[in-house]
């Protein structure tokens, strides 16, 4: 049975040239977690797998950094990347979870931080 | 427990346009992608693409594009996949699945749709 | 587009033996493979998703490997319902592309 909870940074936006990162946390399981995939909705960003280690997809390697931790950092950010960003745990024995961020790159200097949420 | 159930059988001239439904239900429609699959006659599966619903975003297989459009209603949670300028090779079961992004967990019974003179 | 390329088109084995279904795809796709079970006039059922990763409710004489380009679906020991055609899926990125299928037959 899965008991876990995904817990994201939600809703964030940030600044165009600038950069942010995509984070999440799974609690209230004792599964192990043996991949983390970060996608959009029609293409992989990365993966962190706990024997292969990061990959990180051609199309992003010039401005994407792995972590902090299982996180993701997205830099030199543009308007195109505002969109929906999905987290992937592979856990073992309970199975996946995801979580769903959705970042705004502005043009102007008031991105904030929207507020934490979880997706169960 | 998730279903995905399609519109039945149709026959097609060729010129036609096709409409098929999926009606959706065991989740929130707006939280997954609908994809559609063709599968011509003893053959193998050919994605044809998907409509994202909770931000309406669309994406199609080059091989499609312009003759194919996917949407769908909210208020029925019902998907559609629309093939236009059909020909002999539009033949073909037509699948709409969903599932983690781009891999399907769930299938409808899939479509016959039969072009024909 | 990514490309991928399964093996054997066809094969035969009898019950209880040991079956390996290879696909190979044109570039890296990391662990993004999935492993679908097709049967005459059914939809197709998902097997293994993310290379390694059985899909709930599948029998664990199931199994998948590999990453980067190289994939393998395992059937451990075949049992009569696994009978079918086998298909694999990148879903690294859009257009999403399956191998041309491997039918599995009664030898």
């Known amino acids: 049975m899965m008991t876990g909870t995904i817990e994201t940074t939600g809703n964030i936006s940030a600044e165009k040239g600038g950069s942010i990162i995509l984070q999440c946390h799974l609690s209230s399981t004792t599964a192990q977690v043996t991949q983390v995939n970060w996608e959009q909705q029609d293409q992989l960003l990365a993966i962190c797998n706990a024997d292969l280690g990061w990959h990180i997809s051609p199309s992003f390697k010039d401005r994407v950094a792995p972590g902090p931790g299982l996180g993701l950092t997205l830099q030199s950010l543009t308007v195109n990347d505002t969109g929906e960003y999905f987290c992937i745990y592979h856990t073992y024995p309970d199975g996946t979870y995801t979580g769903r961020i959705f970042l705004e790159v502005l043009e102007s200097s008031v991105a904030e931080h929207g507020a934490r949420f979880q997706i169960p | 427990e998730v279903q995905l159930v399609q519109s039945g059988a149709e026959v097609k001239k060729p010129g036609a346009t096709v409409k098929i439904s999926c009606k959706v239900s065991g989740y929130t429609f707006t939280d997954h992608t609908i994809h559609w699959v063709q599968q011509a006659p003893g053959k193998g599966l050919e994605w044809m693409g998907y409509?994202?619903?909770?931000?309406?975003?669309?994406k199609y297989n080059e091989k499609f594009k312009g003759r194919v459009t996917i949407t769908a209603d909210t208020s029925t949670d019902t998907a559609y996949m629309e093939l236009s300028s059909l020909r002999s090779e539009d033949t073909a079961v037509y699948y709409c699945?969903?599932?983690?992004?781009?891999?399907?967990?769930?299938w409808g019974q899939g479509t016959l749709i039969t072009v024909s003179v | 587009d990514i490309q991928m390329t399964q093996s054997p088109s066809s094969l035969s084995a009898s019950v209880g033996d040991r079956v390996t279904i290879t696909c190979k795809a044109s570039q890296d796709v990391s662990t993004t493979v999935a492993w679908y079970q097709q049967k005459p006039g059914k939809a197709p059922k998902l097997l293994i998703y993310s290379a390694s990763y059985r899909y709930t409710g599948v029998p664990s004489r199931f199994s998948g490997s590999g990453s980067g380009t190289d994939f393998t679906l395992t059937i451990s020991s075949l049992q009569p319902e696994d009978f079918a055609t086998y298909y694999c899926?990148?879903?690294?990125?859009?257009?999403?592309?399956f191998g041309a299928g491997t039918k599995l037959e009664l030898k």
């Open positions: 699945a969903t599932g983690m992004l781009r891999w399907f967990a769930d």
């Open positions: 409509f994202y619903p909770r931000d309406g975003s669309t």
């Open positions: 899926q990148q879903h690294y990125s859009t257009p999403l592309t």
